[in-house]
């Protein structure tokens, strides 16, 4: 039973590699998936000596480890690329690193933008 689920229909979109991949750089993404499957938003980023470099944001297909996550929180200690996923429209706007071994929680706030809608 999926009791606490927040339906995800739209996510913040970003692609640092947009020129090479011939996509938009940023905006909103409408999520599409198979019937009866849940959808999520995600964010991925690098942290080079405290400087945050966004990699990608967007929709994420049904993934059980994303269920019931209202906030986008990465917990891996020191990966090459940080990853988080969540449920609920635009839940990937803000993202957080909360390392498993303790340490400080770091939340990344997006700069204000006027996003374009991607379909």
């Amino acid at each position: 039973s999926g009791r606490g689920e927040a339906e995800t229909r739209e996510c913040i979109y970003y692609n640092a590699n947009w020129e090479l991949e011939r996509t938009n750089q940023s905006g909103l993404e409408r999520c599409e998936g198979e019937q009866d499957k849940r959808l999520h938003c995600y964010a991925s980023w690098r942290n080079s000596s405290g400087t945050i470099e966004l990699v990608k944001k967007g929709c994420w297909l049904d993934d059980f480890n994303c269920y019931d996550r209202q906030e986008c929180v990465a917990t891996e200690e020191n990966p090459q690329v940080y990853f988080c996923c969540c449920e609920g429209n635009f839940c990937n706007e803000r993202f957080t690193h909360l390392p498993e071994a303790g340490g400080p929680e770091v939340t990344y706030e997006p700069p204000p933008t006027a996003p374009t809608l991607l379909t």
Epitope: S1, G2, L61, F64, N65, Y67, V73
Partner: antibody
Framework: EVQLLESGGGLVQPGGSLRLSCAAS????????MSWVRQAPGKGLEWVSA????????YYTDSVKGRFTVSRDNSRNTLYLQMNSLRAEDTAVYYC???????????WGQGTLVTVSS | QTVVTQEPSFSVSPGGTVTLTCGFN?????????PSWYQQTPGQAPRTLIY???TRSSGVPDRFSGSILGNKAALTITGAQADDESDYYC??????????FGGGTKLTVL
């Protein structure tokens, strides 16, 4: 180091109940979805149940629906499987497993044996 | 009811290459099912080999690789060794919380 330690297995009569526990350490339990997988003697692995990070979403294989209940206590870093109306065909080693992104089992416990017999 | 199928048994010579497959009865396996592979020796807990179709788990030698072959997920072992003799299981994630194991393949190295 990630550790998953199951307990609570044993011999029980058909129709009886057992509660399995899985004590987790070495990772942030409240941030991980979890699952139970079982293996009958001489048989293959079978997924039994899964529970989301908050416990708000729970899922079961058809053969245990209505008889088994999965739950978690994030303050105690413990996963549970309450098994009621047990049948001979529930006899198996029960493993708890941590579920990671891409919905795979990245860590496994050593298992606890449940024997249902009269 | 989804049934995930694997070859019941397979033999490979030491140093040889073997490909185990994983399909299901309701269509083609794709990356959206996040195919994963596990190795199990008798009396031991399973060990994670491959996840997300083709990503090796930490500490798994690069002799093990995963892919999609046609309409199935595949696990390839190149340069098979005696201690690769084990049972191998694939898992497909069907969505909505449901994971389905294949019946397993008993691999013999001889």
């Amino acid at each position: 180091e990630v550790q998953l330690l199951e307990s609570g297995g044993g011999l029980v009569q058909p129709g009886g109940s057992l509660r399995l526990s899985c004590a987790a350490s070495g990772f942030t339990f409240r941030n991980s979805a979890m699952s139970w997988v079982r293996q009958a003697p001489g048989k293959g692995l079978e997924w039994v149940s899964a529970i989301s990070v908050t416990g708000g979403s729970t899922y079961y294989t058809d053969s245990v629906k209505g008889r088994f209940t999965v739950s978690r206590d994030n303050s105690r870093n413990t996963l549970y499987l309450q098994m009621n109306s047990l049948r001979a065909e529930d006899t198996a080693v029960y493993y708890c497993a941590k579920v990671y992104y891409y919905s795979f089992f990245d860590y496994w416990g050593q298992g606890t044996l449940v024997t249902v017999s009269s | 009811q989804t049934v995930v199928t694997q070859e019941p048994s397979f033999s490979v010579s030491p140093g040889g290459t073997v490909t185990l497959t994983c399909g299901f009865n309701s269509g083609s396996v794709s990356t959206s099912y996040y195919p994963s592979w596990y190795q199990q020796t008798p009396g031991q807990a399973p060990r994670t080999l491959i996840y997300n179709t083709n990503t090796r788990s930490s500490g798994v030698p690069d002799r093990f690789s995963g892919s999609i072959l046609g309409n199935k997920a595949a696990l390839t072992i190149t340069g098979a060794q005696a201690d690769d003799e084990s049972d191998y299981y694939c898992v497909l994630y069907m969505g909505s919380g449901i994971h389905v194991f294949g019946g397993g393949t008993k691999l013999t190295v001889l």
